[in-house]
Interface confidence: medium
């Protein structure tokens, strides 16, 4: 979690002198409670916006907007603490609006916005706005919270942001997977315009189950420049496993901008349709494919006789 660096943060508006400060997320009013505290924010809204840094990079940001209730407690409102919590890491970042002048009622409702918290693709956040000073220990809460889910890099607007482009969002491999026969699976995909290697992970599952009964990793060396944007195909040798029939193929690129953390693309081949009178399936789960000459052991990572070609 971080703040967008593009310019000085402002919270002043006509009728209010205000400054934005970094916050430890532990306002002084927690430690030294006040007798009179303002009411909670009203109509907290969080939206996905996009903003450029000074360097011209485009980032997704949380656009936070709220209004004040029209009660006399605004006379005691000294500011607000904005907190963003990333739910999967428990990382929290806060800023504080410090009002340098007293708020007065005016003909329209006071409205505040802040759009400088940079958020990550495919992450969920809890956004909280606390009015300051915070309430006494048993006082009514004067904050409002909302959860905010950031779309992943498949989202049209997200796809062109710097974090998504860095993780390879512009690459569309257009994967096709075809069962050639009971022992062979053919994977076709489009190479990107970078001389980097790829990894194909084949994971097979029994019909209707999520425990893998087969896993195999295949390495594809870096293509030459003349092969960029061309179709590449790989033929993977399977074993005719009874019941181990649903195959998921995942392609992981290793682009220089994202290394081990590039976006992975996958495609799935479903189990064939059951005939009207199916053969009885034994209650055991066979595992692996026959050894081929190039393979050291038959196991989860170096099943032999997979090979690949690049098409022009």
């Amino acid at each position: 979690l971080r703040l967008l660096d593009h310019r000085a943060l402002v919270c002043s508006q006509p009728g209010l002198n205000c400054t934005v400060k970094n916050s430890t997320c532990l306002d002084d009013s927690w430690i030294h409670p006040r007798n009179l505290t303002p009411s909670s924010p009203k109509d907290l809204q969080i939206q996905l916006h996009f903003a450029h840094t000074q360097q011209g990079d485009l980032f997704p940001v949380a656009h936070i907007e709220w209004t004040l209730q029209t009660d006399a407690s605004i006379l005691y409102l000294e500011g607000a603490e904005l907190s963003v919590l990333q739910l999967n890491t428990n990382e929290r970042l806060c800023v504080r609006f410090e009002f340098l002048s007293k708020l007065r009622h005016h003909h329209r409702r006071w409205r505040f916005t802040f759009s400088h918290f940079v958020v990550d693709p495919d992450q969920e956040y809890e956004v909280t706005v606390h009015h300051l000073p915070k309430p006494i220990p048993d006082g009514d809460p004067n904050h409002q919270s909302k959860n905010f889910l950031v779309p992943d890099c498949e989202h049209a607007r997200m796809k062109v942001t710097t974090p998504c482009m860095s993780s390879g969002s512009l690459w569309d491999p257009n994967i096709t997977v075809e069962t050639l026969d009971t022992q062979h699976l053919r994977v076709d995909f489009t190479l990107w315009n970078e001389s980097t290697h790829y990894q194909i992970l084949l994971t097979s599952f029994p019909h209707m189950e999520n425990h893998s009964c087969f896993e195999h990793m295949h390495h594809i060396p870096a293509p030459r420049p003349e092969e960029f944007h061309q179709r590449s195909n790989v033929t993977l040798t399977l074993r005719n496993l009874k019941g181990c029939c649903r195959h998921q193929v995942q392609i992981q690129p290793f682009f220089s901008s994202c290394l081990n953390d590039c976006l992975r693309h996958s495609a799935t081949v479903s189990c064939p349709e059951m005939p009207d009178t199916p053969e009885p399936i034994p209650d055991y789960m066979p595992l692996w494919e026959p050894r081929s000459g190039s393979s050291d052991y038959k196991d989860d990572d170096d099943k032999g006789s997979s090979h690949h070609h690049h098409h022009h």
């Epitope: 893998s212 896993e215 055991y284 066979p286 050894r291 052991y297």
Partner: antibody, heavy 116, light 107 residues
Framework: QVQLVQSGAEVKKPGASVKVSCKAS????????ISWVRQAPGQGLEWMGW????????NYAQKLQGRVTMTTDTSTSTAYMELRSLRSDDTAVYYC?????????WGQGTLVTVSS | EIVMTQSPATLSVSPGERATLSCRAS??????LAWFQQKPGQAPRPLIY???TRATGVPARFSGSGSGTDFTLTISSLQSEDFAVYYC?????????FGGGTKVEIK
């Protein structure tokens, strides 16, 4: 050369949990799965389960389902096996081994003693 | 699950003699069978995989044969360092299962 180095011996009370680590070196950790096998004193070998170091997929022995959790930390090339609700018959040497099916390298073993 | 049965439980052999160890599966495991050697206080050591292929660094006196349900590990001429417990293991079906072991001792 390939090495799997396991954490030290543990003594636990019934009902407690134990977490055994297995640090791999000498090869690319995410290319090979890690399996766990245990051996009770004077007894044979018992397969406990397997974890894919690449995808995180797991497959556990039916009798341990619900009590065992296998995890990996690819940043340190370490696999972990946690066993909960320990009973006296869980007293055994616990081995990690490389690969999913046929085990070509083994850790030195970790003795876990469960005793009140 | 597939039950692996090893026989005999103990085999007494003199150094230099031939030792033949048997492993039987309760149903076919094709050639998906491995043999391991274990000495007291040590981890198992891989000897054979795919029923008949020697693992890296394993002496030629160790050989494996069989497919389906019946498998054999043969040590052509026992050396002093070969006295140990030997386990077979099938990896054709989940759960993976081991035989109970054969102890090869000095006669």
């Amino acid at each position: 050369q390939v090495q799997l180095v396991q954490s030290g011996a543990e003594v636990k009370k019934p009902g407690a949990s134990v977490k055994v680590s297995c640090k791999a070196s000498g090869y690319t950790f995410t290319r090979y799965g890690i399996s766990w096998v245990r051996q009770a004193p004077g007894q044979g070998l018992e397969w406990m389960g397997w974890i894919s170091t690449y995808s995180g997929n797991t497959n556990y022995a039916q009798k341990l389902q619900g009590r065992v959790t296998m995890t990996t930390d690819t940043s340190t090339s370490t696999a972990y096996m946690e066993l909960r609700s320990l009973r006296s018959d869980d007293t055994a040497v616990y081995y990690c081994a490389r690969r999913q099916l046929y085990f070509d390298y083994w850790g030195q073993g970790t003795l876990v003693t469960v005793s009140s | 699950e597939i039950v692996m049965t090893q026989s005999p439980a103990t085999l007494s052999v003199s150094p230099g003699e031939r030792a033949t160890l048997s492993c039987r599966a309760s149903q076919s495991v094709s050639s998906n069978l491995a043999w391991f050697q274990q000495k007291p206080g040590q981890a198992p050591r891989p000897l054979i995989y795919d029923a008949s292929t020697r693992a890296t660094g394993v002496p030629a006196r160790f050989s494996g044969s069989g497919s389906g349900t019946d498998f054999t590990l043969t040590i052509s001429s026992l050396q002093s360092e070969d006295f140990a417990v030997y386990y077979c293991q099938q990896y054709d079906n989940w759960p993976l299962t081991f035989g109970g072991g054969t102890k090869v001792e000095i006669k």
